[in-house]
Interface confidence: low
């Protein structure tokens, strides 16, 4: 069957009639429905949630809508027993302490369940020493510290602020440096922006504001108890003691009005350099300890969080492909959120409600799409991305199979400047030609295209007349279907300007006060921003499952690896002489992108020419670019990471949030003029540049003639 | 604030049953966790049953499964405890308790900090 014969609507018409039906109004309706109390994972208000949107996904025609559930490990604080930290006298007496909760926004006083600021996941603990400034607690921090200015970190408390990493990197690495206890904290450097009001009155963060988030350091593993394997009724699951990237040092977060108190004392060295100074009126001195008057004061922290296991509940929804049911496209992002969610994630479910429905009408004037969609509702992202990798665990079988692309929808805004994507670069071309035929919502820009917008706001710095697209790292539910099964995926979202607002994500991540009236209010009133964020990921999903051909591009891969294959080598040359006495050459990586760059384009050329009438060279071909993704996939995975197994790309084992090209290659060489061992430093470098060069070259040949 | 009171207490023969009730009024939003405490003379309060807001969480005790149920009626904001089979070891002054949701596993345990009408008294005797 042609796609045609699937439906009673041209496809020209098909996209216009899907596209047309998306409303800016009911995306407004669907978040304040989803933000009116909080949902936090593991809670009964996210399941009645669930539940609702199972109702509602019905009603707007999916062909099935079911529960899955699982029981994970999840982090709550102790209800009797809140966590907080104190300045102590010498006498032991706490002669200051922070705050136990957020100041609740106007309208939502009396609002039960708020959880209060947690960093979910820190072992109970009640430390007590002198604090260390850290910065950001970054790797380049902690080297700053102990190799020039021979600070040493163990036994000490050590207090950083959020922004520029996920913020399980930096407890990692202070946990590394020897520290007893981590606090964390928003400065308004990175979470005032410059000239606006705080909630309520604009949307930067207030002193009393604080950044909840987990801690962990899974690296893709899912629920911490049962990695590889789905938290299921039957699960074995592993000690507390074994389980998987628990921090070992109790940690919490405050805000700046008590960060100032902690800060203001600080003693020891100045700090080393202006990047080191937030916009607090403190000195920034880096310690160890209080200054003179304060010397024999302490910093005590107190948590009593526990690890619980608990249920969660993802709702999948399913529109059956007419012509290819075996093949899947995949819309998903996350419902549960820390308070309300106004922001993350509700934003990006209320996008994924309404293109359900747009769906859902089409499929009840007898339109269907070519390919089956799967729509999906996670649970316990902010737990560690558990509800998408427990469901892509138990389903991966079909999954590694049938997966033709998974598109990400948590928050659909983090600014209203313009559009941001990062996607594998199969989908590049896909982007480019859906965004040239939407108009853009920017004032300046009526009557243009949002590829024009796009482009003029957010350049690409390689290729002029483009727009910038960033390389997925993680810190979100596409993690597993693209890390670990090779699922080619991409994901879209309205974004600030990066050149004069460099504050890490938005001010109100995570906070109580990331509210409906928060988007209403200051982000996006009219809701265009969001209307365009639902046309860009449900046109990405339409033309996923519905064109005839698969709308990847293999040769965009090709234009990449070269790419990423001359930085990694340039990394490398910063060391000429040990390349030289170990005998590290990139010849045989640099061999496997030309055989693949050559490969590609006689595949797109092929992929012109054929018969599309024929439907078993129809499913071959597209099953050859259904499975390139896949071939990038190495069973063993990273060194250490098993369950990152891309070999094109993996989150920097700096920053979760970031993606990095040729990782096996890129951590082999990172700092390798410290290592111990320089022989076996550099034969680790020669055994991932010849993993990279057959992975690519394995890869290659999938895109060859099969017989 | 909110504010629980409970009756169909009373005196009944072994063997026989009673059907307790517990009306919540005031501020009932986000109360999503009721159940029922009971207190024997001398004794510690102990845990009977919980139920979560959607009815889809039930936890019975022990000592008291097979033979109490507990049930909820959202419509009229009403928690319901249907005792059979009564034995003496049931007597006891009957709380019904009321949370906000404590996070997690332990959903289901109820403490000073949350609501508790003020009891009614169950005897079970020949």
């Known amino acids: 069957k042609s796609s045609n014969e699937a439906t009673n609507i041209t496809p020209k018409h098909n996209m216009k009639a899907f596209l047309d039906e998306l409303k800016a109004e009911n995306i407004k309706k669907f978040l304040y429905n989803f933000t009116q109390i909080p949902h936090l994972a593991g809670t009964e208000q996210n399941f009645q949630l669930a539940k609702q949107i199972q109702s509602q996904w019905k009603e707007f025609g999916l062909d099935s809508v079911e529960l899955a559930h699982y029981d994970v490990l999840l982090s709550y604080p102790n209800k009797t027993h809140p966590n907080y930290i104190s300045i102590i006298n010498e006498d032991g007496n706490e002669i200051f302490n922070t705050s136990l909760f957020e100041p609740p926004p106007p309208g939502y006083e009396n609002v039960s369940d708020i959880v209060p600021p947690f960093s979910a996941f820190s072992p109970q603990g009640m430390p007590e020493g002198d604090l260390v400034y850290v910065n950001y607690a970054r790797t380049e921090d902690f080297f700053k510290l102990e190799r020039d200015m021979k600070i040493n970190c163990s036994g000490k408390i050590v207090i950083a602020r959020y922004g520029k990493v996920f913020r399980g990197n930096k407890v990692k690495n202070a946990q590394l440096a020897g520290a007893k206890g981590v606090i964390l904290y928003s400065d308004p450097a990175d979470y005032f922006a410059p000239g606006v009001k705080s909630y309520p009155d604009g949307w930067n963060l207030p002193g009393g504001g604080v950044q909840r988030g987990n801690i962990l350091n899974l690296n893709g593993a899912g629920d911490p108890l049962t990695p590889g394997y789905p938290a299921n009724e039957y699960a074995y699951r592993r000690g507390i003691a074994e389980a998987v990237g628990l921090p070992s040092i109790p940690v919490h977060p405050i805000g700046y009005y008590d960060a100032q108190k902690l800060l203001e004392k600080m003693g020891g060295s100045a700090p080393p350099d202006s990047s080191w100074r937030g916009s607090l009126k403190v000195p920034y001195n880096v310690g160890p300890g209080f200054t003179g008057n304060f010397s024999t004061q302490k910093v005590k922290m107190h948590i009593h969080s526990t690890n619980e296991v608990t249920r969660i509940y993802n709702v999948i929804g399913t529109l059956r492909g007419a012509v290819e049911p075996d093949r899947y496209v995949i819309l998903g992002g996350h419902r549960d959120s820390w308070v309300f969610g106004g922001i993350d994630p509700q934003s990006g479910a209320a996008v994924v409600h309404e293109i359900v429905r747009s769906f859902g009408t089409l499929k009840k004037e007898g339109w269907r799409p070519r390919r089956t969609i799967l729509f999906a509702s996670w649970d316990a992202e902010e737990f560690g991305l558990l509800g998408s990798t427990e469901w892509a665990e138990e389903n991966s079988r079909l999954l590694q199979e049938r997966g033709v692309a998974y598109i990400n929808a948590d928050s659909s805004i983090e600014g209203n400047y313009t559009l941001r994507v990062d996607c594998t670069p199969l989908m590049y071309s896909l982007v480019h030609n859906l965004t040239k035929e939407l108009k853009s919502p920017d004032e300046g820009f009526e009557g243009k295209s949002l590829y024009e917008s796009w482009t003029k706001k957010s350049p690409s710095p390689e290729f002029s007349g483009m727009p910038r697209i960033s390389k997925l790292g993680s810190g979100n539910d596409f993690e597993v279907f693209f890390q670990r099964l090779g699922i080619a995926s991409g994901r879209a979202r309205y974004t600030k300007n990066w050149e004069t607002n460099k504050f890490s994500g938005y001010p109100l991540y995570h906070s109580v006060y990331e509210t409906y009236e928060l988007v209403e209010k200051f982000y996006d009133p009219m809701f265009k921003y969001h209307l365009t964020v639902a046309q860009v990921r449900g046109g990405m999903v339409f033309e996923l499952a519905n064109s005839i051909v698969l709308p990847f591009d293999c040769r965009d891969y090709a234009v990449v690896l070269r790419k990423y294959a001359d930085k990694i080598y340039s990394i490398s040359m910063k060391h000429p002489q040990e390349m030289k006495t170990y005998s590290v050459s990139f010849d045989s990586l640099f061999s496997a992108v030309k055989n693949f760059t050559e490969i590609a384009s006689k595949f797109s050329e092929r992929l012109q020419d054929f018969d599309k009438s024929n439907p078993i060279v129809l499913r071959m071909m597209n099953d050859q670019l259904m499975f390139l993704e896949r071939a990038f996939i190495d069973p063993l995975g990273l060194p250490d990471r098993p369950f990152y197994r891309h070999v094109i790309y993996a989150p920097s084992s700096h920053n979760k949030y970031a993606g990095e090209s040729f990782p096996g290659i890129y951590d082999a060489l990172f700092d390798i003029e410290s290592k111990v061992d320089p022989s076996k430093a550099w034969g680790e470098v020669k055994r991932q540049i010849y993993v990279a060069a057959f992975t690519v070259q394995a890869a290659a040949e999938t895109l060859s003639e099969v017989a | 604030q909110v504010q629980l009171v409970e009756s169909g207490g009373g005196v009944v023969q072994p063997g026989r049953s009673l059907r307790l009730s517990c009306a919540a009024s005031g501020r009932t939003f986000g109360i999503y966790v009721m159940g029922w405490v009971r207190q024997a003379p001398g004794k510690e309060r102990e845990f009977v049953a919980a139920i979560s807001w959607s009815g889809s969480d039930r936890l019975v005790s022990d000592s008291v499964k097979g033979r109490f149920t507990i049930s909820r009626d959202n419509s009229k904001n009403t928690l319901y405890l249907q005792m059979n089979s009564l034995r003496a070891e049931d007597t006891a002054v009957y709380y019904c308790?009321?949370?906000?949701?404590?996070?997690?596993?332990?959903?289901?345990?109820?403490?000073?900090?949350?609501?508790w009408g003020q009891g009614t008294q169950v005897t079970v005797s020949s």
């Open positions: 308790a009321a949370s906000n949701r404590l996070y997690g596993r332990t959903w289901y345990d109820f403490n000073e900090s949350d609501y």
